[in-house]
Interface confidence: low
Amino acid sequence: NIDVCKLGTVTVQPAPVIPLGSAANISCSLNPKQGCSHYPSSNELILLKFVNDVLVENLHGKKVHDHTGHSSTFQVTNLSLGMTLFVCKLNCSNSQKKPPVPVCGVEISVGVAPEPPQNISCVQEGENGTVACSWNSGKVTYLKTNYTLQLSGPNNLTCQKQCFSDNRQNCNRLDLGINLSPDLAESRFIVRVTAINDLGNSSSLPHTFTFLDIVIPLPPWDIRINFLNASGSRGTLQWEDEGQVVLNQLRYQPLNSTSWNMVNATNAKGKYDLRDLRPFTEYEFQISSKLHLSGGSWSNWSESLRTRTPEEEPVGILDIWYMKQDIDYDRQQISLFWKSLNPSEARGKILHYQVTLQEVTKKTTLQNTTRHTSWTRVIPRTGAWTASVSAANSKGASAPTHINIVDLCGTGLLAPHQVSAKSENMDNILVTWQPPKKADSAVREYIVEWRALQPGSITKFPPHWLRIPPDNMSALISENIKPYICYEIRVHALSESQGGCSSIRGDSKHKAPVSGPHITAITEKKERLFISWTHIPFPEQRGCILHYRIYWKERDSTAQPELCEIQYRRSQNSHPISSLQPRVTYVLWMTAVTAAGESPQGNEREFCPQGKAN
């Protein structure tokens, strides 16, 4: 308790390590013949308190005992957890210029006695591993605390290891360095942890276990898979395991999946047949092991084996659609389109498509292979034609899908009625219709087809389509639907040998157009004015244009302008008006209207009609 220094000593009562909440007395004594020269009675001893090297208090007022010029005792209370430094200094009061001189110092540690360690858990990793135990130490003691782990077992087996916790490191795990072997499988072992520091000691409750309780097998290794006859759905998974393993758990899943397929295998001896794999699919396989059917712990999962199953021939039916265009009086161009098979149908990398166009009477057959999802040919307009497409991978081809080539919009009686298009949200449109009224043959299916109404879209972009069963009268279209773009939507009703269609325009979201149409010319013919314009550029339309409005008023008039509203038609770019007075100068302009509102006005043109008014 005494720190001997040159000028004097500092002692602590009851001890330099005290429990939280306790007080301590610190005495500072000068050695003989030390102190202020000539004037021993002017010796003043002061005590300074430092925390983390910072002066926090002068304990001058805490003096409880004083031998003038020789020794002083101070009481310190409310010390915080951890280390606090106290330094005693000598102040010679007759010399104001000299600072106090350090006499001696002492560090007091405040902490708590250790709590009994709890939640002891022991493991041995693998048959050749060593026993390691961990525990919960409880509250931080703020003091150096020693922990002893003791193990006892059959045949007078005893073993112990020690470690300590302080402000730099934590001790809550120890490896005993001994190996428990399977021949001790039925034996019971006991461990306990004892904690001790300067303020007390405590011991855990004894923790009892057997070999099977604590041995965790090493995870399986060297995992591989063999596909039987290059099958894409059957494979034998193989692996290496520790000798005592009797139970394995296998889990496997496609890489993009969120749920595992789980299999338990007893006495698998490093081999298991899987029969339900998907061809041409990236899989992840993992295996875990256990040493006993009922007791013991599972090993960690093995490292993943990632591999792709082999291909198998495609299954499923291609979704085919087509466009027909007459070229001249005896030739037509047929463009076939089809959608890629989804991965579970393709069952491999599609290498090409086999396309056949055949005249029904078998007079003419055109065949080709292509890697694209479209094919165009010019054929005679005479005869009844049918098309078929199949998809091929390295293992074979899918069954061909057939479609009859009919005049898609040729039969008015098959045209669906009351077609409407409503925007549902930013990226889809709900299309509804009523069946044809007087169809003389049954509707086999509906096709809803759409494409953006933008220049060149027919030649540049393939159509998008959905097949709808004959008893459904609605479709939610979303593929390639973007806001503020107008789409032409066609609903086709197809029978075995005929087709009828109705058309509508629709958008998923709209705004008022950015600008109005640009008037290019005003001409006078037979007492009528013809207004000609150019359409609003496609990006500025911002949805489907419903109407154009032509406004006019006398040049210097402050009256409201008159207007004429025209139903929008893409093919129309001029319109007559006939209510203008001759020899009066008018100002004319145009706007465009979507469901969201009217555009700003386009350019203004002045015109003075010459003819006679109606």
Epitope: N52, D53, V140, C163, N167, R168, Q169, N170, C171, R173
Partner: nanobody
């Protein structure tokens, strides 16, 4: 109390390397978790890397911001009371004032990644990466 002083900043070409040092004074330095933060002009101070005072049982724990993983390495030398930040493959986005910071935790197997978890800060050193 620990005091911190950074050094080693400067101007470097994109793709180059720099090593920042942080000198710490104070006897309890080795029990502090220490981090590097940076602040680009007009932006908030952001965590770059941190190292805990794990002690001899499990060793030091390091933590890095996603943007610097694989390029920056934080280390400490308790005997010299120094922390280092080795910066490789520097990018113009790494430009800013780099600060050394320290925090004392009851349990030190943890590296804080927000500025308010650190109690002591250095003055900072400027790093400029030109393209």
């Amino acid at each position: 109390q620990v005091q911190l002083q950074e050094s080693g900043g400067g101007l470097v070409q994109a793709g180059g390397s720099l090593t920042l040092s942080c000198t710490a004074s104070g006897r309890t330095f080795s029990s502090y978790t220490t981090g590097w933060f940076r602040q680009a002009p007009g932006k908030e101070r952001e965590f770059v890397a941190g190292i805990s005072s794990g002690g001899s049982w499990i060793g030091d724990i390091t933590s890095y911001a996603d943007s610097v993983k694989g390029r920056f390495t934080i280390s400490r030398d308790n005997a010299k009371n120094m922390i280092y930040l080795q910066m490789n493959s520097l990018k113009p986005d790494d430009t800013g004032v780099y600060y050394c910071a320290a925090a004392s935790y009851g349990t030190r197997y943890y590296v804080g990644s927000t500025a308010n978890e650190y109690t002591t800060w250095g003055q900072g050193t400027q790093v400029t990466v030109s393209s």
